[in-house]
């Protein structure tokens, strides 16, 4: 995930005024890990698996819809925004279905669910180092998606340690 | 519960056409690329033509290209494969196949065939 | 395209392990299906993902994949899991089979 495209994406921010209606721009993209293991969905109707595994060369990877908003409400940190507005990103891996933080069992789910999308569907992006991203839970400042045990998982980051952790670091790339 | 029924299947000369139709039920039918697979009397299994979930993109078998025509009707749930040119090596139980997983933004052609009809038999002969 | 080959048949005795071939070039770089067909019956998928098993399959079926063959180990082969067994894999969005093995319990 190269610096521009956050670059990029705080000019699209700065030309239009829409906070959390509608997305200000609308991105797919793969996501892996720092450690470059993919996320992947096996989805069906009524159930799901999200994997974090090493990818075989012809195995595609999977794609998510990354949604960016605008908010004006401060996480915990200072976000990558502009203006002091926070850019926040939901995550569909196909039609109709959306990441989730479930912060009672400290865990991310995919649901099915209709617009306006629940505030649990949404994340602040922070842009970190080596082209690496973080995403927030809006609802629970200060956890984040990581990487547990081969899943992700919803993970309480302490400020006064490094930011940087490796388990809630991903990268984003068009390929 | 999944359910996969084709139809259509019969007795055609050389150089007919016929439709096949497998009604789907039991899931979001949209949500899911569909397969359409066949096998010929005491053979094994050939892999004919595939569609998305939107119906946007269609693959076929080198076999079949230019001869046969895979749809869908979503709002019917219901795949439809048009053969027509038919041949002698057309003979076959054709069955329809539901990817055993919803299809990603990533699109293509990746998923194992989870759910299977029970097959309609086309036989082309004089 | 890439030939899937597998042995037209293998006999194993009830209670012993059955192992099924399927052999390609680069095979180990695709992940390899494995369906289960019984004479006059739609096949029915017993391994994804080269290692992977549907819900619904007994822990007996097991899968491998790498180098040049995919292998479907069935270990303590019952009565019930005589039938032919296909492999698949996808190929530039094409599906291919092999040949299919006819497993006979003696």
């Known amino acids: 995930f190269e610096a521009q495209k956050i670059e990029w994406h705080e000019a699209a921010i700065e030309g239009r005024s829409i906070t959390g209606i509608s997305p200000i721009t609308e991105y797919l993209a793969s996501l892996s890990t720092y450690n470059d293991q993919s996320i992947t969905f096996a989805l069906e109707d009524e159930s799901y698996e999200i994997y974090v595994e090493d990818l075989k060369k012809d195995k595609k990877k999977d794609k998510v819809l990354l949604s960016y908003y605008e908010s004006q409400h401060p996480s915990s940190e200072s976000g990558d925004g502009v203006d002091g507005k926070m850019l926040m990103v939901t995550l569909s891996p196909t039609k109709d279905f959306w990441l989730q933080a479930n912060n009672k069992e400290h865990s991310v789910e995919l649901h099915k669910c209709e617009k306006p999308l629940p505030d649990q569907a949404f994340f602040v992006l922070h842009n970190r180092s080596f082209n690496c991203v973080s995403f927030e839970c809006k609802t629970d400042p200060g956890v984040f998606i990581g990487v547990k045990d081969n899943h992700l998982a919803l993970i309480k980051v302490d400020y006064s340690e490094n930011l940087g952790s490796e388990n809630i670091l991903f990268k984003l790339s068009e390929i | 519960e999944v359910q996969l029924l084709e139809s259509g299947g019969g007795l055609v000369q050389p150089g007919g056409s016929l439709r096949l139709s497998c009604a789907a039920s039991g899931f979001t039918f949209s949500s899911y690329a569909m397969s359409w697979v066949r096998q010929a009397p005491g053979k094994g299994l050939e892999w004919v033509s595939a569609?998305?979930?939107?119906?946007?993109?269609?693959y076929y078998a080198d076999s079949v290209k230019g001869r046969f025509t895979i749809s869908r009707d979503n709002s019917k749930n219901t795949l439809y494969l048009q053969m027509n040119s038919l041949r002698a090596e057309d003979t076959a139980v054709y069955y329809c196949?539901?990817?055993?997983?919803?299809?990603?933004w990533g699109g293509g052609l990746r998923y194992p065939f989870g759910y299977w009809g029970q097959g309609t038999m086309v036989t082309v002969s004089s | 395209l890439p030939v899937l080959t597998q042995p037209p048949s293998v006999s194993v005795s009830p209670g012993q392990k059955a192992s099924i071939t399927c052999s390609g070039e680069?095979?180990?770089?695709?992940?390899a299906a494995w369906y289960q067909q019984k004479p006059g019956q739609s096949p029915i998928l017993v391994i994804y993902?080269?290692?992977k098993r549907p819900s619904g399959i007994p822990e007996r079926f097991s899968g491998s994949n790498s180098g040049n063959t995919a292998t479907l180990t069935i270990s303590g082969t019952q009565d019930m899991d005589e039938a032919d067994y296909y492999c698949q894999v996808w190929d530039s969005s094409t599906g291919v089979f092999g040949g299919g093995t006819k497993v006979t319990v003696l």
């Open positions: 680069r095979m180990g770089d695709k992940y």
């Open positions: 569609i998305s979930g939107s119906g946007g993109s269609t």
């Open positions: 993902q080269d290692t």
């Open positions: 196949a539901r990817d055993l997983w919803i299809q990603l």
